[in-house]
């Protein structure tokens, strides 16, 4: 399937969005900062394009969860919040046309189910960081600038993918 | 898991509007959305439309375009199903539905309903 | 839009058999996104078998997903009298997003 060019544009208004919904300087949080061990072999060269999607979904679809909290909500500029939804929201259904794309030709497994597990596991360590700090305006500073830079080595993934074809 | 509650069975005049109400709660996330199914009695379900909560985003199935409005509510986490000029046809039961955030992978959890309301049944009567 | 019947309409099995329900689209569905469920009466339908063939939380592995293409199947390897009910196979297609169920197969005791 080749994800539409739109696709890879949403992925840098993602990033920016990202950016502009900074609020404190990440200097003031240094006491914060935590390794949340994001699983970057998983979106390493190694896999095949079909079995990337799910894993850039399962990506995506966390960032979408994670912002779309309550907690998250009173954290964060309503506007920008919204615009970045609508970015994740777009990204999830260029990946999902992308399986049904799919049909006809020899479908292979959707299932990379370590990787998924590994991203998943990968999110439930920043939730439960944001829960022990108490959703404070530093935890989520240190979580944005966290999502900020797995977002952007998962982006590189997609463009590496793009430059095979 | 997620409790998905609708409102009670209401009993309505053809011509008229009905609106059914269902609040979810348990491990909910508005960036997952929330469909309508109904099932005429004897009948099999038919998917009526969906929204997406976080940004309020409709998909309507193609029968009911022009009398169907979803709406939803971030907190609590409610949708809302609303359908206008009411014909004898839509008597039925009216669930709401929803996908699993813990469907592996999540590319398949809004393809499918994980949890079902108790259902919500509407009569239409003269 | 996609169309999708299944067959057959009434499936008449004493307990300890085993069934076969077909489902058939009237174009290409992809496997992943084909979706069974049971429905008892009075009762809410419940999630059986996603993605084509994954089951469930919970349900029982006498259960079982199949196919591909245009032609999918449920088989139950052995009814237990808690199987009987209406099952309901559903695709999903998307950009629009668009569910489609299938008219449902009863299961009911011979």
């Known amino acids: 399937c080749d994800l539409p060019q739109t696709h890879s544009l949403g992925s840098r208004r993602t990033l920016m969005l990202l950016a502009q919904m900074r609020r404190i300087s990440l200097f003031s949080c240094l006491k914060d900062r935590h390794d949340f061990g994001f699983p970057q072999e998983e979106f390493g060269n190694q896999f095949q394009k079909a079995e990337t999607i799910p894993v850039l979904h399962e990506m995506i679809q966390q960032i979408f969860n994670l912002f779309s909290t309550k907690d998250s909500s009173a954290a964060w500029d309503e506007t920008l919040l919204d615009k970045f939804y609508t970015e994740l929201y777009q990204q999830l259904n260029d990946l999902e046309a992308c399986v049904i794309q799919g049909v006809g030709v020899t479908e292979t497994p959707l299932m990379k189910e370590d990787s998924i597990l590994a991203v998943r596991k990968y999110f439930q360590r920043i939730t439960l960081y944001l829960k022990e700090k108490k959703y404070s305006p530093c935890a989520w500073e240190v979580v944005r600038a966290e999502i900020m830079r797995s977002f952007s080595l998962s982006t590189n993934l997609q463009e590496s993918l793009r430059s095979k074809e | 898991e997620v409790q998905l509650l609708e409102s009670g069975a209401e009993v309505k005049r053809p011509g008229s509007s009905v609106r059914v109400s269902c609040r979810a709660s348990g491990d909910t996330f508005s960036s997952y959305p929330i469909s309508w199914v109904r099932q005429a009695p004897g009948q099999g379900l038919e998917w009526m439309g969906r929204?997406?909560?976080?940004?309020?985003?409709?998909n309507y199935a193609q029968n009911f375009r022009g009398r169907i409005t979803i709406t939803a509510d971030k907190s609590p986490l409610t949708a809302y199903l609303e359908l206008s000029s009411l014909r004898f046809e839509d008597t039925a039961v009216y669930y709401c539905?929803?996908?699993?955030?813990?469907?592996?992978?999540?590319?398949?959890?809004?393809?499918?309903?994980?949890?079902w309301g108790q259902g919500s049944l509407v009569t239409v009567s003269s | 839009e996609i169309v999708l019947t299944q067959s057959p309409g009434t499936l008449s099995l004493s307990p300890g058999e085993g069934a076969t329900l077909s489902c058939r689209a009237s174009q290409n569905v992809s496997r992943h996104y084909l979706t069974w469920y049971q429905q008892k009466p009075g009762q809410s339908p419940r999630l059986l078998i996603y993605g084509g063939s994954s089951r469930a939380t919970g349900v029982p592995d006498r259960f079982s997903g199949g196919g591909s293409g245009t032609d999918f199947t449920l088989t139950i390897s052995r009814l237990e009298p808690e199987d009987f009910a209406v099952f309901y196979c559903q695709s999903y297609h998307s950009p629009p997003p668009v569910y489609t169920f299938g008219q449902g197969t009863k299961v009911e005791i011979k």
């Open positions: 929204i997406l909560p976080a940004l309020g985003v409709t």
């Open positions: 539905a929803s996908p699993s955030a813990d469907i592996i992978p999540s590319i398949l959890g809004t393809t499918l309903f994980a949890f």
